[in-house]
Amino acid sequence: EWIKFAAACREGEDNSKRNPIAKIHSDCAANQQVTYRISGVGIDQPPYGIFVINQKTGEINITSIVDREVTPFFIIYCRALNSMGQDLERPLELRVRVLDINDNPPVFSMATFAGQIEENSNANTLVMILNATDADEPNNLNSKIAFKIIRQEPSDSPMFIINRNTGEIRTMNNFLDREQYGQYALAVRGSDRDGGADGMSAECECNIKILDVNDNIPYMEQSSYTIEIQENTLNSNLLEIRVIDLDEEFSANWMAVIFFISGNEGNWFEIEMNERTNVGILKVVKPLDYEAMQSLQLSIGVRNKAEFHHSIMSQYKLKASAISVTVLNVIEGPVFRPGSKTYVVTGNMGSNDKVGDFVATDLDTGRPSTTVRYVMGNNPADLLAVDSRTGKLTLKNKVTKEQYNMLGGKYQGTILSIDDNLQRTCTGTININIQSFGNDDRTNTEPNTKITTNTGRQESTSSTNYDTSTTSTDSSQVYSSEPGNGAKDLLSDNVHFGP
């Protein structure tokens, strides 16, 4: 049976004063000669020769300085041999522990840690966790690190706290304001021996970025604007409306959206935002009509692309800015409205028979023009004549078979209204369906024919006139007149609604 004893040795110092550091003895030595042998790391395995044994007495001595961080303990395998080299005992495993000294400072896993936290975050919100290790003995004061913030920039008031044991950095309060400071730099010290005065220390930097939240309400540079706009014109840059927002530039928290509160019911205006400058461009996208409206008041509001942060939801009140718009009159003169009309000519109509009227409207008065003269423009087969004063259209002659064949039963010509004062000419399109050539039936003109107009009203008449409403173009403007005006003028029985 083995009798054994082993003391611990201390790293980094001369342990020879403690020798023998261990002693082994077998009770087989009572009746025979025993030789003691040892093996293992520090003996016959690197680092060699740290331990030596007196083969006769079993005393084990330590010969050199040891490092716990390299070898925290030594396992010495001991044998008791007889004179023939045979084992007298089951080999013994002897453990020699190496006692720790505080010879290693804490080491941060990074020289500079990076973290981020939203402004206005609640107090005690986790920002980041610092990581540091100490090579000294685990679960020992020599490796127990205490963390401490030793410097904060800007240093106005402390904004962060650190858990001395875990290295967790948290917010001290809820006053972080990116608009005041967008970045903080902390210096943190980690000291072993749980922060004791006899401990070793290391330092690291922490860069904390303060993330923007939408806690600033956008507002327009001016509370009111005054503009003038000519009627009948489009404008892609009528007014620049600058928005001020203190949140992070170019972020959705900063980008503004200007919207109409009232006044734009006719959808004449649009506001396009420049996302680089936060300037809204007021555009005219639908022409205004001075005759219908000489001025209007627009009311506009502003919000951000992003939702407002909960911290300012209750503070947000919609503040409107006013835009006073004056519409300037433009002398417009006469135009054909509608720009195209369709008529029917039947086979029994002859020379000078009335086909219909095509009258220019004075846009400045809304009444038939009194200042124009009418002439035919394009007049295929020289079919029509026009009264230069009244705009009355008549057949020059009864339609011949040759004319009918040449036109294929369809006539399309133009009428011109010429205003010599304004030096302005407008064009209207005349469409004629030539019906039943060679047949004397009065097609589609029987008395009491029921025709439902676009207004839904029914008329019982032997003489009906319907204008088709299409698009008319003059030299400067495009107008879109609404269909559905119903029966406006009751003309002679050779006028037909529709193409």
Epitope: S39, Y77, Q86, D87, L88, E89, R90, E93
Partner: antibody, heavy 117, light 110 residues
Framework: QVQLVQSGGDLVQPGGSLRLSCVAS????????MSWVRQAPGKGLEWVST???????YYGDSVKGRFTVSRDGSKNTVFLQMSSLKGEDTAVYYC???????????WGQGTLVAVSS | ELVLTQPPSASGTPGQRVTISCSGS????????VNWYQQLPGTAPKLLIY???QRPSGVPDRFSGSKSGTSASLAISGLQSEDEADYYC???????????FGGGTQLTVL
């Protein structure tokens, strides 16, 4: 590299005898401590015996007096002589070497001993 | 009866950490070092941990051993499907004058 090749497993009647062999390569059996470990079908490992030297061997209580461990340095072989075999000795027997760390670190492939009438 | 006590089974999902315990007495674990073996189905056991916490070369550092008083434990972190096996603890017992094994723990990777 270290290798242990076993032989001698067989079907034997209760009360009978059997000798298992284990040939080592890659090391000398005289310089190592050699063990036998067995595993009954569907059961765990059970230590049988270890030889430390010609004068020092240990045996498990269940085989004491019936089994003998020995080694032959010239053949680099370890033997397990089994006698008075019982049904409960039925198992796969593993030969194993015990390195300097007093740890069974190398194992043979195992050989089946079946004791049945 | 068994001198070292192990749970008969343990399980975990891939990536998880599992621990297998081994309980003994002052005459075995209390006074000797503990070894751990892994036995894959149909193969011989393989040394996993010796001297309580030492890993032989070739054994991944996912396997670690520890000993405290009369108990020892094997921890496997980052569990992998190939870890599915039987695990045995072993030590020397001074009063029995022999080596003793635990009953084994069957580890299942779910």
């Amino acid at each position: 590299q270290v290798q242990l090749v076993q032989s001698g497993g067989d079907l034997v009647q209760p009360g009978g005898s059997l000798r298992l062999s284990c040939v080592a390569s890659g090391f000398n059996v005289n310089d190592n401590y050699m063990s036998w470990v067995r595993q009954a079908p569907g059961k765990g490992l059970e230590w049988v015996s270890t030889i430390y030297s010609e004068t020092l061997s240990y045996y498990g209580d269940s085989v004491k007096g019936r089994f003998t461990v020995s080694r032959d340095g010239s053949k680099n072989t370890v033997f397990l002589q089994m006698s008075s075999l019982k049904g409960e000795d039925t198992a796969v027997y593993y030969c194993a070497s015990e390195g300097g760390g007093l740890t069974i670190d190398y194992w043979g492939q195992g050989t089946l001993v079946a004791v049945s009438s | 009866e068994l001198v070292l006590t192990q749970p008969p089974s343990a399980s975990g999902t891939p990536g998880q950490r599992v621990t297998i315990s081994c309980s003994g007495s002052s005459s075995n674990i209390g006074s000797n070092t503990v070894n751990w073996y892994q036995q894959l189905p149909g193969t011989a056991p393989k040394l996993l941990i010796y001297s309580n916490n030492q890993r032989p070369s070739g054994v991944p550092d996912r396997f670690s051993g520890s000993k405290s008083g009369t108990s020892a434990s094997l921890a496997i972190s980052g569990l992998q499907s190939e870890d599915e096996a039987d695990y045995y603890c072993a030590t020397w017992d001074d009063s029995l004058n022999g080596r003793v094994f635990g009953g084994g723990t069957q580890l299942t990777v779910l």
